[in-house]
Amino acid sequence: PEPPTACREKQYLINSQCCSLCQPGQKLVSDCTEFTETECLPCGESEFLDTWNRETHCHQHKYCDPNLGLRVQQKGTSETDTICTCEEGWHCTSEACESCVLHRSCSPGFGVKQIATGVSDTICEPCPVGFFSNVSSAFEKCHPWTSCETKDLVVQQAGTNKTDVVCGPQDRLRA
């Protein structure tokens, strides 16, 4: 019979012959022959192959380097790579998430518009008139100035974007 020029899915062509690919989690030890099947071996500890393949070496699981702020989100198997994520309080530098950076805090005078996630930094916004923030924080929004009137008090010191108003008693000695 004519030797094949193409093989079925999950097969590969070698020496004019269709051999079975190794299943995910296994690597190729030897190609099939006219008389023998493809020989495959399971990947070792901390190794994986995630496709039907003819690879002679398994890939090493990704190392989630703690010095880069990374931790294991999902442990790898013989068929899947390890998934790294950033430690809490840190976020990925890029989409590839090969390193992390500490979430930024919003300085006094600024409040948190959007809290940081594992893939995005804190977004800060200036406190508008009537609001203040007197702390550096990755969580605190701008707080509204205290309403002196509702406490039957008067403003003794105006508020700023960094300080609350200071309330005081009303002057009873009006002429």
Epitope: D65, P66, N67, L68, E87, E88, G89, T93, S94, E95, A96, E98, S99, V101, L102, R104, S105, D121, S136
Partner: antibody, heavy 114, light 112 residues
């Protein structure tokens, strides 16, 4: 091999600006922020801030806001720091360091003198 | 800002002996998720700083195991056993739990 190659020494006049560079090689430039650190002669280290080459995000030490501007260029894998309105207080060696603080440039010496 | 204090400006040591360098922070460096963010660096004369220890006690790649770090909260120690001539330089601690990151003033290791 990871390397950070910084530009050469600068002698500048008070009031002028200076822009120094830090060229990265041996790793994916956009995967790490680049920190900048100041060291005055015979003194300790001071953190200036960082630039994230992936999205051009920056974060500055309040003390250096208005003094330092951090940028980067993905195409050349280079981070930059510009210092403005220079005074004698800005005379120092400036280092760039990769985001894990595991690799540092050799430093750029800036001398401000009339 | 967090203030990092290295009380001893210098420590003299005889080669082959052990030495400890201390560092204190004005605020705990323990993050709410449980990790403590303190680096140790060595700056040899005329060179750039190099990382020795990260997260208090983890040895950085390529650093001899004569170096070790310990401590928690606000008090930290770098220990060098069997000091060698090449260990001379200034040792800095640095916190990176909160912006701006801050360094200690440095401790100079001198050979007797």
């Amino acid at each position: 091999e990871v390397q950070l190659q910084q530009s050469g020494p600068e002698l500048v006049k008070p009031g002028a600006s200076v822009k120094m560079s830090c060229k990265a090689s041996g790793y994916t430039f956009t995967s790490y922020v680049m920190y900048w650190v100041k060291q005055k002669p015979g003194q300790g280290l001071e953190w200036i801030g960082y630039v994230n080459p992936y999205n051009d995000g920056t974060n500055y030490n309040e003390k250096f806001k208005g003094k330092a501007t951090l940028t980067s260029d993905k195409s050349s894998s280079t981070a930059y720091m510009e210092l403005s309105s220079l005074t004698s207080e800005d005379s120092a060696v400036y280092y760039c360091a990769r985001g894990a603080m595991d690799y540092w440039g050799q430093g750029t010496s800036v001398t401000v003198s009339s | 800002d967090i203030v990092m204090t290295q009380a001893a400006p210098s420590v003299p040591v005889t080669p082959g002996e052990s030495v400890s360098i201390s560092c204190r922070s004005s605020k705990s460096l323990l993050h709410s998720q449980g990790n403590t963010y303190l680096y140790w660096f060595l700056q040899r004369p005329g060179q750039s700083p190099q990382i020795l220890i990260y997260r208090v006690s983890n040895l950085a790649s390529g650093v001899p195991d004569r170096f070790s770090g310990s401590g928690s909260g606000t008090a930290f120690t770098l220990r060098i056993s069997r000091v060698e001539a090449e260990d001379v330089g200034v040792y800095y601690c640095m916190q990176h739990v909160e912006y701006p990151f801050t360094f200690g003033s440095g401790t100079k290791l001198e050979i007797k």
